[in-house]
């Protein structure tokens, strides 16, 4: 029942939660929109001015088992002339996203949620320069 | 499915994919790692396809706040400061998995719920559809 | 034994300031967001203010806005509110409640609830 309601009985538990051991949550991995798809520009990542390359970390105990990392293929940008300018730098952009870990002790089987962090792409960025006095 | 060995002695010496329900411990690994893109880097001022950071918040979600990226220009910054519309700034996008209460009521009972955001942006040539 | 205990309530003049804790033993607040809750004579249970366990956002109910503010310390595995500008409506018993990972606008998601504390506003 939501907040606010009339003569609700606060620390009942409604029958219809599921039983969960101390210490634990119960965690259904069907995930909601999961048809959902990015809808990125496309070829965007050799077309960038840092383009990168993508590649799939595979784990059989982390679910999703395929995670998609980016790699910057070059230190500077890509000039209009193609060619690498090293006076700007390309540079990785992260993002965290959670997983499910599944750990093996013995014969028993426990899951840890897990956060990590995904390469998604690079961007052209003007250095930082440090002047030593 | 993918099957993994397992320690021969163990009564059910495979495990298949994974269940549709999983009972997880609560200490999350790697919680701690700093979240606020703003603080980690500067990269969103420093870029030539510069971006501002958007706080999307959901108290019933974990994380319960998270960063949106929207491109500041059509064009990209050239050498002189100034936009170069024959480049485009385009946000790189990406799936992320977080946690939503379901059902809403209970309290120890979670769901994966994949959400799309912008996360940066980056230059990129434009493609130049060409008119017969 | 696993509790929260909600300190910090008593008598004040409309206008004055006061800072409720609550402290939880039994249990860690590391994973749980933290809601206060309050409840006037003859009235419903309203949440007026959550503070998350990712990242510690507020959130405020709309009466309390710009002059409550909650706050987390995970170290001494203590919630705060402190209250401004107390105004005679504010009076009600203050209850604190921790919920599982995110906050919720539903009573029962809420796993564990102190005792309360009596916080009365009257010139």
């Known amino acids: 029942r939501k907040i606010p309601k009339v003569g609700h009985t606060f620390f009942q538990k409604p029958e219809s939660c599921p039983p969960v051991p101390g210490g634990s949550m119960k965690l259904d991995i069907g995930i909601i929109n999961e048809n959902q798809r990015v809808s990125m520009s496309r070829n965007i990542e050799s077309r960038s001015t840092s383009p990168w390359n993508y590649t799939v970390t595979w784990d059989p105990n982390r679910y999703p088992s395929e995670v998609v990392q980016a790699q910057c293929r070059n230190l500077g940008c890509i000039n209009a002339q193609g060619k690498e300018d090293i006076s700007m730098n390309s540079v990785p952009i992260q993002q965290e996203t959670l997983v499910v870990r599944r750990k093996h002790q013995g014969c028993s089987v426990s899951f840890q949620l897990e956060k990590v962090l995904v390469t998604v792409g690079c961007t052209c960025v003007t250095p930082v320069i440090h002047h030593v006095q | 499915g993918i099957t993994i060995p397992r320690n021969p002695g163990c009564p059910n010496s495979e495990d298949k994919n994974f269940p549709r329900t999983v009972m997880v411990n609560l200490n999350i690994h790697n919680r701690n790692t700093n979240t606020n893109p703003k603080r980690s880097s500067d990269y969103y001022n420093r870029s030539t396809s510069p971006w501002n950071l958007h706080r999307n918040e959901d108290p019933e979600r974990y994380p319960s706040v998270i960063w949106e990226a929207k491109c500041r220009h059509l064009g990209c910054i050239n050498a002189d400061g100034n936009v170069d519309y024959h480049m485009n700034s385009v946000p790189i996008q990406q799936e992320i998995l977080v946690l939503r209460r379901e059902p809403p009521h209970c309290p120890n009972s979670f769901r994966l719920e994949k959400i799309l955001v912008s996360v940066g942006c980056t230059c990129v040539t434009p493609i130049v559809h060409h008119v017969a | 034994e696993v509790q929260l205990v909600e300190s910090g309530g008593g008598l004040v003049q409309p206008g004055e300031s006061l800072r409720l804790s609550c402290k939880a033993s039994?249990?860690?607040?590391?994973?749980?967001?933290l809601g206060w809750f309050r409840q006037a004579p003859g009235k419903e249970r309203e949440g007026i203010s959550c503070?998350?366990?990712?990242?510690?956002?507020?959130y405020y109910t709309d009466s309390v806005k710009g002059r409550f503010t909650i706050s987390r310390d995970n170290s001494k595995n203590t919630v705060y509110l402190q209250m401004n500008s107390l105004k005679t409506e504010d009076t009600a018993i203050y209850y604190c409640?921790?919920?599982?990972?995110?906050?919720?606008?539903?009573?029962?998601?809420?796993?564990?609830w102190g005792q309360g504390t009596q916080v009365t506003v009257s010139s």
């Open positions: 039994g249990f860690s607040l590391d994973y749980y967001a």
């Open positions: 409640a921790a919920a599982l990972l995110t906050c919720s606008s539903y009573y029962d998601a809420y796993t564990y």
């Open positions: 503070i998350t366990s990712s990242d510690a956002s507020a």
